[in-house]
């Protein structure tokens, strides 16, 4: 992209409540892909907070693309009553926190975490690697942030935001230091390379989120995770564009978004990413 394509969006306050995304891909911009078909599809627009129509070229693109308006709404919007703050002093847990742990049918035996509604705590379990349900977290911290109550009985979201008991407002807690880069791509791009269970030595690429580059690794031929691409180009296309450079908290964000400048605040963003 040329420098003219880059947009420097100033993040400023508006009347919009904080945006809560059910899936990280809902934040992706509409991507028509390189092909030339004319297919009516829908995407979630984080600026208008609505599902909107766009023309898809028929190949590639990204996950923010749905066959119908209903599917888009189901995946990316929440009922306003549940959106951010309950009238009580406690935010509502996502429904999937109340599902039982589910190992799925595969045989990967991966350590994951689930919220146990009996003990009200996040606990470890063995996940097979496929199917299962959304009460399935890669880290204990992620599980706690999304499903456990905070120390005062308040629901804490996965950006360390807690409902303030004094004025019912959302206040950022210092549980996470904002980093220079924030990732808004598929969650599997943040997982480590996983050789898998078999004995082959296939050349694959994985996205190294620490250095922000796609690197080769040897894949065993089965198992593993989705941070696994047959080419460097495919890896970059899937993962590289997920990064947004953050200059300062509430400051400048440099994006490569070809759209007119809009002033919007995406405050204390909650992204419930569950890639199964």
């Amino acid at each position: 992209d040329s420098e003219e394509d880059e947009e420097h969006t100033i993040i400023t306050d508006t009347e919009l409540p904080p945006l809560k995304l059910m899936h990280s891909f809902c934040a992706f911009k509409a991507d028509d892909g390189p092909c030339k078909a004319i297919m009516k599809r829908f995407f979630f627009n984080i600026f208008t907070r609505q599902c909107e129509e766009f023309i898809y070229g028929g190949c590639e693109g990204n996950q923010n693309r749905f066959e119908s308006l209903e599917e888009c709404k189901k995946m990316c919007t929440r009922d306003n009553a549940n959106r951010i703050i309950k009238t009580t002093l406690q935010q509502e847990k996502p429904d999937f926190c109340f599902l039982e742990e589910d190992p799925g049918i595969c045989r990967g035996y991966i350590t994951r975490y689930f919220y146990n509604n009996q003990t009200k705590q996040c606990e470890r379990f063995k996940y097979g690697g496929c199917l299962g349900n959304m009460n399935n977290f890669e880290t204990l911290e992620e599980c706690k942030n999304i499903c456990e109550d905070g120390p005062n009985g308040f629901q804490v979201d996965n950006y360390g935001t807690q409902l303030n008991a004094v004025n019912n407002s959302l206040t950022p807690q210092s549980t996470k230091v904002p980093s220079l880069f924030e990732f808004h791509g598929p969650s599997w791009c943040l997982t480590p390379a996983d050789r898998g269970l078999c004995r082959a030595n296939e050349n694959r690429f994985y996205y190294n989120s620490v250095i922000g580059k796609c690197r080769p690794f040897k894949y065993s031929g089965c198992g593993g995770n989705e941070n696994n691409f047959t080419s460097k180009q495919e890896c970059l296309r899937a993962c590289k564009k997920g990064f947004i450079q953050r200059i300062s908290k509430g400051g400048l964000i440099k994006t490569k978004r070809k759209r007119k400048k809009q002033r919007v605040k995406i405050a204390y963003e909650e992204i419930f990413v569950k890639n199964m």
């Epitope: 996950q63 049918i105 595969c106 496929c130 598929p186 031929g221 089965c222 198992g223 989705e226 696994n228």
Partner: antibody
Amino acid sequence: QVQLQQSGPGLVKPSQTLSLTCAISGDSVSSNSAAWGWIRQSPGRGLEWLGMIYYRSKWYNSYAVSVKSRITINPDTSKNQFSLQLNSVTPEDTAVYYCARTMSKYGGPGMDVWGQGTLVTVSS
Amino acid sequence: DIVLTQSPATLSLSPGERATLSCRASQNIGSNYLAWYQQKPGQAPRLLIYGASTRATGVPARFNGSGSGTDFTLTISSLEPEDFAVYYCQQLNSIPVTFGQGTKVEIK
């Protein structure tokens, strides 16, 4: 050789319950490496996965959202079979119903054994 | 739900020709969780390929699966008379399990 034999009525009245059974031979419904499920096929809908059960030190089930409020899949370990119950049926539930085993092999999962299929018509 | 789109809807070929069937997923499903099935009229589907590229027991070597992420291909290197049927792809990555709408391979 694993085989699945389906049984159950081919005609169900609207608002009633569709009940089918799938008898397993050559494997166990309590197998630790398989899942047992139901799929239906109709001209309008194509192949539609309805749900499955599997045993991994305890029983688990997963159902399709489209039928979640109406469906029950149960194992019967004494007879080595599993059943499908679909409540409050309508003519839209008319389809060929298949039971199938999903095996998780080391290359990945797949439905490797299927029942013969039962055409269920919902009509008064 | 993960939507699987198969193309073309119909493929008209002669015995001995090569068939290339495509399956595109609406989300990344990795490389281990895609299966291909063959179905003939009046019969249940038959598993051909699992894990995107592994042939099921008894499936002839002319059937080959490839792909990962969102784009998958089933290739029949040289069509035999018994290969004319409908082919479905299926993802077993996440609930609900979903199928493509099918590609019919018919005799030209």
